[in-house]
């Protein structure tokens, strides 16, 4: 399930079987003490602050071409909202979005704490080059986190970090169709820490979901549900404080 190339490689085209010009900064930044790229809070980048500190602002670890970087677009977690506030990257030289959606900014949950479990509507389903970003903090003594990309009652992609499964930390991915769970795919690399903030990014590609946590590539999961346009809801649950959930096209 996991692959051995960095997300920087995958997204910049190097070593990627389907290079499509993803932003090169995703996944190649060193993680700081706080689990975000570059440094711990506060001040990962000039003018930045922890998630939710300033409504309308880009999330920590934003990078050119990432959510919040489009001119005049609301930052992740603002739906709809004002342009990106101080701390968002300048908009010059950004790639324009391509594909089914216009190059609009991220849409999703309002900024600030969200009630978990939380459902993020994906009105047109998911499409390749769609980037879903979830910001939050793992609760102390957490047991589980779950993301469920849903097609009606089916779960197209279940992403389930488990903090204590037989005294081990593991990420389980699966699909549930017609109330039947399929074959589990397990990943032992575990980037989540109880009590610490996190950023999960899910990039939809033609053949798989690609997942990065704290700007480091984690895993990919081949599509088992082919009708991506029918995956119209993302359920977010588990032992987290959720700051924002949003999506954009890259």
């Amino acid at each position: 399930m996991a692959d051995n190339f960095s997300l920087h490689d995958a997204l910049s085209g190097s070593g990627n079987p389907n290079p499509q010009g993803w932003p090169g900064a995703w996944g190649n930044q060193p993680a700081g003490a706080g689990g975000y790229p570059g440094a711990s809070y506060p001040g990962a980048y000039p003018g930045q602050a922890p998630p939710g500190a300033y409504p309308g602002q880009a999330p920590p670890g934003a990078y050119p071409g990432a959510p919040g970087a489009y001119p005049g677009a609301p930052a992740p977690g603002v739906y709809p909202g004002p342009p990106s506030g101080p701390g968002a990257y300048p908009s010059s030289g950004q790639p324009s979005a391509t594909g089914a959606y216009p190059a609009t900014g991220p849409y999703g949950a309002p900024a600030g704490p969200l009630i978990v479990p939380y459902n993020l509507p994906l009105p047109g389903g998911v499409v390749p080059r769609m980037l879903i970003t979830i910001l939050g903090t793992v609760k102390p003594n957490a047991n589980r986190i779950a993301l469920d990309f849903q097609r009606g009652n089916d779960v197209a992609f279940h992403f389930n970090p488990r903090f204590n499964e037989n005294n081990r930390r593991v990420i389980v991915c699966n699909t549930k169709l017609d109330n039947n769970w399929g074959r589990e795919e397990r990943q032992s690399v575990f980037p989540f820490e109880s009590g610490k903030p996190f950023k999960i990014q899910v990039l939809v590609e033609p053949d798989h979901f690609k997942v990065a946590v704290n700007d480091a590539h984690l895993l990919q999961y081949n599509h088992r549900v082919k009708k991506l346009n029918e995956i119209s809801k993302l359920g977010i649950s588990g032992d987290i404080d959720l700051t924002s959930a949003s999506y954009t096209m890259i």
Epitope: N179, N180, G182, R183, R224, K226
Partner: antibody, heavy 120, light 107 residues
Framework: EVQLQQSGPELVKPGASVKISCKAS????????MHWVKQSHGKSLEWIGY????????GYNQKFKSKATLTVDNSSSTVYMELRSLTSEDSAVYYC?????????????WGQGTLVTVSA | EIVLTQSPASLSVTTGEKVTIRCITS??????MNWYQQKPGEPPKLLIS???TLRPGVPSRFSSSGYGTDFVFTIENTLSEDVADYYC?????????FGAGTKLELK
């Protein structure tokens, strides 16, 4: 190459039951749904339901829920369909067909069909 | 359930002629339509799957188009080996349903 080999023709009496089989070879058996389709003589096709061999999960056309039961034996890569309380309306050719993992998908591979004749 | 209305029920053509078969669905199914060919004594054969996708090994004279509720299956330059029954199948929702079929004959 995927192959689906079905059991031979059956002649059964009204009110009885019959169990027909479909043995798969040539690919990962457990990871694809196996569907059953009915074709009455000179008529169109009707989807009966499917079974997911990995865990035995099933999905049925409501019309056939009280008529058909689907089971699987993973050790022999074989799926079965039992038809009960047979009447002349159940006389048909029954096909197994391999679908994709997603039960909402097409069937690319079919068995040769099993003719079931219900007659006194 | 989704009802598929397939037409015509039968048609007779000469070799080299173009054949058009239509399938109309009772509700919108996006592009989740599939087309099968069935010859006497044989199981159906998948020609075209969802998204108007020609299956590997199927001659390019077969094609389909459509989205939503209206779908068309076409054979360009019909050959004698194309004599068969043709069925549409929707894979958008359970229960999966087929059209009533079209019997293609040669004059």
């Amino acid at each position: 190459e995927v192959q689906l080999q079905q059991s031979g023709p059956e002649l059964v009496k009204p009110g009885a039951s019959v169990k027909i089989s479909c043995k798969a070879s040539g690919n990962t058996f457990t990871d694809h749904n196996m569907h059953w389709v009915k074709q009455s003589h000179g008529k169109s096709l009707e989807w009966i339901g499917y079974i997911y061999p990995y865990n035995g999960g099933t999905g049925y056309n409501q019309k056939f829920k009280s008529k058909a039961t689907l089971t699987v034996d993973n050790s022999s890569s074989t799926v079965y369909m039992e038809l009960r309380s047979l009447t002349s309306e159940d006389s048909a050719v029954y096909y197994c067909a391999r679908g994709e993992y997603d039960y909402l998908a097409w069937f690319a591979y079919w068995g040769q069909g099993t003719l079931v004749t219900v007659s006194a | 359930e989704i009802v598929l209305t397939q037409s015509p029920a039968s048609l007779s053509v000469t070799t080299g002629e173009k054949v058009t078969i239509r399938c109309i669905t009772s509700i919108d199914i996006d592009d989740d339509m599939n087309w099968y060919q069935q010859k006497p004594g044989e199981p159906p054969k998948l020609l075209i799957s969802e998204g108007n996708t020609l299956r590997p090994g199927v001659p390019s004279r077969f094609s389909s188009s459509g989205y939503g509720t209206d779908f068309v299956f076409t054979i360009e330059n019909t050959l004698s080996e194309d004599v068969a029954d043709y069925y549409c199948l929707q894979s958008d929702n359970k229960p999966l349903t087929f059209g009533a079929g079209t019997k293609l004959e040669l004059k």
